[in-house]
């Protein structure tokens, strides 16, 4: 069966929005008026994961690409990227672990916990114009909460 | 409160269409999608479609495809679900119900029910 | 589409009874299954949803358990107004689909 996805933009908590860089990152910066049009729609797809209480699994494609957040490690560091798939194959229902997010929402607040990596989150900076990327800290300088706004499929 | 209110009785003829509504208050409407399902006399129940308001997104059960068109008013946060080409057997209660946009937590609210009768 | 095979259809208990339903899926679901309860001439009532969390405001009383394709709902303790028809749905597939339901009587 076919997996259940929606269409999404996400801002940071400070409203900055993703954007790509290059071809294979995401930056957050914040966008006004028509350079609005330039964030990124999200695919997000409901995937099958380990059960958890308050965790959703899900998997983060970039709309009509093939491009998936993933978790991999590098140089022994949990690190997050775009990687291409196969569209045939893709989505799908057991996605692997590295595409899965454990979406944590709390007053319509969302984290995004690496499934492959427990307590590692989708971050931004506090500063413009950097890369989206895989932090390990909570509740610190980086920003780990996001909102989601729906776009029409 | 968080509740849905949905529209009074109807008495249809056969070939006819009714449009049901389900209002929402007390919580985002955006964020839920509403499931229409149907409960004909003494019969089990029937999921009909879905939509979810925030996106604009609805699914339906191939079985009422062309039949039933289900639509939403964010601005009142009210819900319809119309179904044409009535006969006798879709006589039944419509029940609205609300589920989180992840699906997570199932059909966790419902309308009261608004009787359908179609007879000639 | 996925059947769900309810079980039984009907059940005779006093109150204080440990009560379990059981509901088959024909296919795996995941953790898509809900329990709700409907008295006659009312709206159904959601119970658990994702198998076994408990709705708020349901009591204790109520739990859900199983997976990919075998569910349960248990009522430990039968309490006078527990006498209703049980549902189970599957919602992890359209079209969504219930099971037949099971009537829970007084003995």
């Known amino acids: 069966a076919p997996v259940r996805s929606l269409n999404c933009t996400l801002r940071d908590s400070q409203q900055k929005s993703l954007v790509m860089s290059g071809p294979y990152e995401l930056k957050a910066l914040h966008l006004q008026g028509q350079d609005m049009e330039q964030q990124v729609v999200f695919s997000m797809s409901f995937v099958q994961g380990e059960e958890s209480n308050d965790k959703i699994p899900v998997a983060l494609g970039l709309k009509e690409k093939n491009l998936y957040l993933s978790c991999v490690l590098k140089d022994d560091k949990p690190t997050l990227q775009l990687e291409s798939v196969d569209p045939k194959n893709y989505p799908k229902k057991k996605m692997e672990k590295r595409f899965v997010f454990n979406k944590i929402e709390i007053n319509n607040k969302l984290e995004f916990e690496s499934a492959q990596f427990p307590n590692w989150y989708i971050s931004t900076s506090q500063a413009e114009n950097m890369p989206v990327f895989l932090g390990g800290t909570k509740g610190g300088q980086d920003i780990t909460d996001f909102t989601m706004q729906f776009v029409s499929s | 409160q968080v509740q849905l209110v949905q529209s009074g009785a109807e008495v249809k003829k056969p070939g006819s269409s009714v449009k049901v509504s389900c209002k929402a208050s007390?919580?985002?409407?955006?964020?839920?999608?509403i499931e229409w399902v149907r409960q004909a006399p003494g019969q089990g129940l029937e999921w009909m479609g879905e939509?979810?308001?925030?996106?604009?997104?609805?699914n339906y059960n191939e079985k009422f495809k062309g039949r039933v068109t289900i639509t939403a008013d964010k601005s009142t946060s009210t819900a319809y679900m119309e179904l044409s080409s009535l006969r006798s057997e879709d006589t039944a209660v419509y029940y609205c119900?609300?589920?989180?946009?992840?699906?997570?937590?199932?059909?966790?609210?419902w309308g009261q029910g608004t009787l359908v009768t179609v007879s000639s | 589409d996925i059947q769900m095979t309810q079980s039984p259809s009907s059940l005779s208990a006093s109150v204080g009874d440990r009560v379990t339903i059981t509901c088959k899926a024909s296919?795996?679901?995941?953790?898509?299954l809900s329990w709700f309860q409907q008295k006659p001439g009312k709206a159904p009532k959601s119970l658990i949803y994702?198998?076994?969390r408990l709705v708020d405001g349901v009591p204790s009383r109520f739990s859900g358990s199983g997976s990919g394709t075998d569910f349960t709902l248990t009522i430990s303790s039968l309490q006078p107004e527990d006498f209703a028809t049980y549902y189970c749905?599957?919602?992890?597939?359209?079209?969504?689909?219930f099971g037949g339901g099971t009537k829970v009587e007084i003995k």
């Open positions: 119900a609300r589920m989180y946009y992840d699906y997570d937590q199932g059909f966790s609210l």
């Open positions: 007390g919580y985002t409407f955006d964020r839920y999608w």
């Open positions: 939509i979810l308001p925030g996106s604009g997104d609805i």
């Open positions: 296919q795996d679901i995941d953790r898509f």
């Open positions: 994702r198998v076994k």
């Open positions: 749905v599957q919602y992890d597939e359209f079209p969504y689909t």
